[in-house]
């Protein structure tokens, strides 16, 4: 039960995280105009990975795409690449994890195959989350650098009379969405990796004693039993000790009560 819950929760958390990464990548507000010096501006600027926008106080918003590839800063290109890699890995991870879910049954897929798929998707989610966090952090670092550079020469005197106020940019909503989404994807990936351990078939032999409440004799069962790979009622190879991880898919082989030692 705990394995299924961990796997299911990992999948849901990763799904939310990847949706957030996609949303952050598409958002226009990666950087927003710093209003510290002019809180009542009639023109508000904000920029995304793909276009820059201007919102006037009249309600009019104008966005212009970056229609050049070569003319864009290398850092922006790197952030775009990291976010896209994160989305692609996350999407593949989601696809793999759907088939790996313990609650979804596909043919006679073995637990070992599901475990491998869960681990694969978990690793993909972790890398996806790290890509998103890295991308957002690189952009944030770029903003901080530019912010202090523009602060250093904020007012350029022109003939001692005229002021040219340079537009400074600060963190936009997309950065926070990206950080949170990347973190969720990462957590989801870790949960999938943890669930994978519980899904892996037990190879270790355990000494177990089965007490039958209905009978008077005590049946000692030396030697281990491997988990049944089928979904049916294989009662001969019933695993006596399951390391505390019981699943809803497990079939109770005997009608009698069992106490595990």
């Amino acid at each position: 039960m705990a394995v299924t819950a961990c796997q299911g929760l990992g999948f849901v958390v990763s799904l939310i995280g990847i949706a957030g990464i996609i949303a952050a990548t598409c958002m226009d507000q990666w950087s927003t105009q710093d209003l510290y010096n002019n809180p009542v501006t009639a023109v508000f600027n904000y920029q995304g990975l793909w276009r820059s926008c201007v919102r006037e106080s009249s309600g009019f918003t104008e966005c212009r795409g970056y229609f050049t590839l070569l003319g864009l800063p290398a850092m922006l290109q790197a952030v775009r690449a990291l976010m896209i890699v994160g989305i692609v890995l996350g999407a593949i991870g989601l696809l793999v994890s759907i088939f790996a879910l313990k609650c979804i049954r596909i043919g006679s897929m073995e637990d070992s195959a599901k475990a491998n798929m869960t681990l694969t998707s978990g690793i993909m989610f972790i890398v996806s989350g790290l890509c998103a966090i890295a991308g957002v952090s690189v952009f944030a670092n770029m903003l901080v650098t530019n912010f202090w550079m523009s602060t250093a020469n904020m007012y350029t005197g022109m003939g001692g009379m005229v002021q040219t106020v340079q537009t400074r940019y600060t963190f936009g909503a997309a950065l926070f969405v990206g950080w949170v989404a990347g973190g969720l994807t990462l957590i989801g990936g870790v949960m999938m990796c943890i669930a994978c351990r519980g899904l892996a078939p037990e190879e270790t032999n355990y000494k177990a004693v089965s007490y039958h409440a209905s009978g008077h004799s005590v049946a000692y069962k030396p030697g281990g039993f491997k988990a049944s790979t089928g979904f049916g009622s294989n009662t001969k190879n019933k695993k006596i000790y399951d390391g505390g991880a019981r699943t809803e898919d497990e079939v109770q082989s005997y009608p009698s009560k069992h106490d595990y030692v």
Epitope: Q33, N38, A42, V43, S52, C53, V54, T164
Partner: antibody
Framework: DVQLVESGGGLLQPGGSRKLSCAAS????????MHWFRQAPEKGLEWVAF????????YYADTVKGRFTISRDNPTNTLFLQMTSLRSEDTAMYYC????????????WGQGTSVTVSS | DIVMTQSPSSLTVTAREKVTMSCKSS????????????LTWYQQKPGQPPKLLIY???TRESGVPDRFTGSGSGTDFTLTIRSVQAEDLAVYYC?????????LGSGTKLEIK
């Protein structure tokens, strides 16, 4: 056709109050920001206040801040300017104007309503 | 607050003459985000409310004759009337549309001989 009609002006006492109205028609009122401007006799234009389509944000000129309140009633397509603590320097022709979507410019103006503050 | 300075305060010209009037701002009205200058020109004829002529420093409002041209960038702007007509007798105001409070110049009064 876009129309803006101001009303509520008149002769007022210093320290008095008055609410100006601007009835709008011919356009989707709630989609546009609105401004009040004024023009003292034989003087230039002065911007007074702004209210966005959704009633927030609101901005005022320093000369009227704390004394004047701009508001709007979108269902009745009406813009208001509540004036309190009136001074002689508030004597002017008051105009309401529609904020053009794009360019931060006023594309339609009312004919104005005259406010005279005198004892 | 941004201070708008217009010059000359008045000018008298003959019909069909070319007229230029200047407007200077104490701060740049150029917005790097969309590469536009937030300066607006209005025309106010005697006894009438103002009328929008030019926005974004050089974009003519629909219905405005093409003899009116706005130019300039940053802090220096010009309104040019290519061939003045009798009906152009008015006061012309420039306005900062970049930041609140919106400030206007004192106006240039155009008179026709």
């Amino acid at each position: 056709d876009v129309q803006l009609v101001e009303s509520g002006g008149g002769l007022l006492q210093p320290g008095g109050s008055r609410k100006l109205s601007c009835a709008a028609s011919g356009f989707s009122f709630s989609n546009f920001g609105m401004h009040w401007f004024r023009q003292a006799p034989e003087k230039g234009l002065e911007w007074v206040a702004f209210i966005s389509g959704g009633s927030s944000p609101i901005y005022y000129a320093d000369t009227v801040k704390g004394r004047f309140t701009i508001s709007r009633d979108n269902p009745t397509n009406t813009l208001f300017l509540q004036m309190t603590s009136l001074r002689s320097e508030d004597t002017a022709m008051y105009y309401c104007a529609r904020f053009r979507r794009g360019g931060n410019a006023m594309d339609y103006w009312g004919q104005g309503t005259s406010v005279t503050v005198s004892s | 607050d941004i201070v708008m300075t217009q010059s000359p305060s008045s000018l008298t010209v003959t019909a069909r003459e070319k007229v230029t009037m200047s407007c200077k701002s104490s701060q740049s009205l150029f917005n790097s985000g969309n590469q536009r200058n937030y300066l607006t020109w209005y025309q106010q004829k005697p006894g009438q409310p103002p009328k929008l002529l030019i926005y974004w420093a050089s974009t003519r409002e629909s219905g405005v004759p093409d003899r009116f041209t706005g130019s300039g960038s940053g802090t220096d702007f010009t309104l040019t009337i290519r061939s003045v007509q009798a009906e152009d007798l008015a006061v012309y105001y420039c306005q900062n549309s970049y930041s609140y409070p919106f400030t206007l110049g004192s106006g240039t009064k155009l008179e026709i001989k």
